[in-house]
Amino acid sequence: KIDACKRGDVTVKPSHVILLGSTVNITCSLKPRQGCFHYSRRNKLILYKFDRRINFHHGHSLNSQVTGLPLGTTLFVCKLACINSDEIQICGAEIFVGVAPEQPQNLSCIQKGEQGTVACTWERGRDTHLYTEYTLQLSGPKNLTWQKQCKDIYCDYLDFGINLTPESPESNFTAKVTAVNSLGSSSSLPSTFTFLDIVRPLPPWDIRIKFQKASVSRCTLYWRDEGLVLLNRLRYRPSNSRLWNMVNVTKAKGRHDLLDLKPFTEYEFQISSKLHLYKGSWSDWSESLRAQTPEEEPTGMLDVWYMKRHIDYSRQQISLFWKNLSVSEARGKILHYQVTLQELTGGKAMTQNITGHTSWTTVIPRTGNWAVAVSAANSKGSSLPTRINIMNLCEAGLLAPRQVSANSEGMDNILVTWQPPRKDPSAVQEYVVEWRELHPGGDTQVPLNWLRSRPYNVSALISENIKSYICYEIRVYALSGDQGGCSSILGNSKHKAPLSGPHINAITEEKGSILISWNSIPVQEQMGCLLHYRIYWKERDSNSQPQLCEIPYRVSQNSHPINSLQPRVTYVLWMTALTAAGESSHGNEREFCLQGKAN
């Protein structure tokens, strides 16, 4: 009842709590002398469902049969209406419509850790829409039964709050959950388990790693576990990898030797635990331990290449270049490179440690036979030295690769192809393809790139340090013993017409012809490999088509003679440059009048 109901009563039959789809009878009756004064026959009793009138009757009582009530709570209120007055509330009642609980499903229990508490979960099934009490019951050895009740509205979890101990780890316990409300009850199927089944160990903690004698091959992982743990599984991976290595161990007692770790690598380690070979569940993975393995001496050998440059009649400049070892070969932080230069006949040797670069330049006499050895050193030792005899790499004309071509191959790649040299092709031990950005001054500071190719290959795809719209000088060397031959070509991965033409800086008269000198187009405006220059000229005030002279591009050329100008005529001259993609806009215009006689 929802208020004091002084004037009358509302009764509900068969009950205030009904099964969905049931019918209820609601009776509203006035108490004696509580009707309308003087006009008791005029009593009008009205029944409201929430705020909606559903029935009325004149007299001292009203009966109403109600069907089709929805799930949940419905409020009925009975009011009295008298003539010339407001309706007076008599009494009311709430009716609760629901269903009996369904059988709870999938009951499962777990204890997190040997000191944890037992908690069980289940699926309630559909909502009953009524207050439903759940009782979790556990039957165990010694004829004991533990139980706990759930006070939550939607109960699908209960924690007993106490701990199952391993005193008889194989003893059976049986759990069951029972749901009860006003319309019925239902129990889950029993779930039977032992201590070993439901205890999920805590993840291992205090994980440490030790390297005996700072060696990666003598590595032990240590951790702490709960006392009853029998099995562990370890997983580890380099920090930059997504794939784990897995190891299962039995009776490890908190330690395990790892034999396959790579040196100088940061690893992530995690451990999980289990109490029994085939019962129970694995713990969560432990927190990660991150640790770097110690260095080992480098393996592998440096890839070394060199350039020779003539200085004068007695001296030459040698520039050595080498590539970093891969991480797996370096096996540590490379502290320095050791370069040894030796004159083979006289036996003089010079050793130098290089830090921070992968190149070295020195000047040596042009006479004698010279060799270099280069090795990489970390804190544990040095790589095997790479030995190279310094020779004239392009001396043997018969070893020069033939028909060298360079073609763009997709974005920032150049495909270099060649034919074997005329001399016995089987004499070639390897090819080296070398490339560097083309700088008109032949700048030796420009980085050098190279790759090695097996003697049976006649092509190489170069992609390292290749930029679009840059021209590269590409050389292919064929090496055979202490001899080498080479051929070169210019190539680019992507090209377009140059952004500007050459700048004419001088025009001079020489014996009836003129010599035009120009400044090279800045590298960043060439937009690829230049194929030709064009020199245009026409008479100053003429509308005729200009004449032109096309000159094949050569790196070092910065002047060209023209001998077809008429004397005492003023000409306008300008230049353009061409790549395979087209011609530049023209450069500056210069006027010139030839003073002498025509040839």
């Epitope: 508490t117 165990g140 139980q147 709050g161 106490i162």
Partner: nanobody, 125 residues
């Protein structure tokens, strides 16, 4: 100083009911496991019922359904409601208290630190 005082014992006909009370002073009942044990003449003390601090209850199957343990935190007291009493329920009933956190420990008398003096229950046929 911790004290446990039982009351509510007496004589009753078979099939009757009794409600035993255990008033506790010096400790809070909701922080401890509370137990009831009984000892019949010439027999060992046996476990009857217990409630953990987390309100998990435990009963031997022999009394389950006839006996209910409950506690009133406000009154700092524990109760044992006994229905459908049988002559074999005749014994001295003891209230006990201890910091027990295990399932098995709730039914073990050596896990309880504090004990009352006991109250006599006699069931006649």
């Amino acid at each position: 100083q911790v004290q446990l005082q039982e009351s509510g014992g007496g004589s009753v006909q078979a099939g009757g009911s009794l409600r035993l009370s255990c008033a506790v002073s010096g400790r809070t009942v909701s922080d401890y496991a509370m137990g009831w044990f009984r000892q019949a003449p010439g027999k060992e003390r046996e476990f009857v019922a217990a409630m953990s601090s987390s309100e998990t209850t435990v009963y031997p199957n022999s009394v389950k359904g006839r006996i209910t343990i409950s506690r009133d935190n406000a009154k700092n007291a524990v109760y044992l409601q006994m229905n459908a009493l049988k002559p074999e329920d005749t014994a001295v009933y003891y209230c006990s208290m201890g910091p027990i956190v295990t399932f098995q420990g709730l039914a073990r008398q050596n896990e309880y630190h504090y004990w009352g003096q006991g109250t006599q229950v006699t069931v006649s046929s």
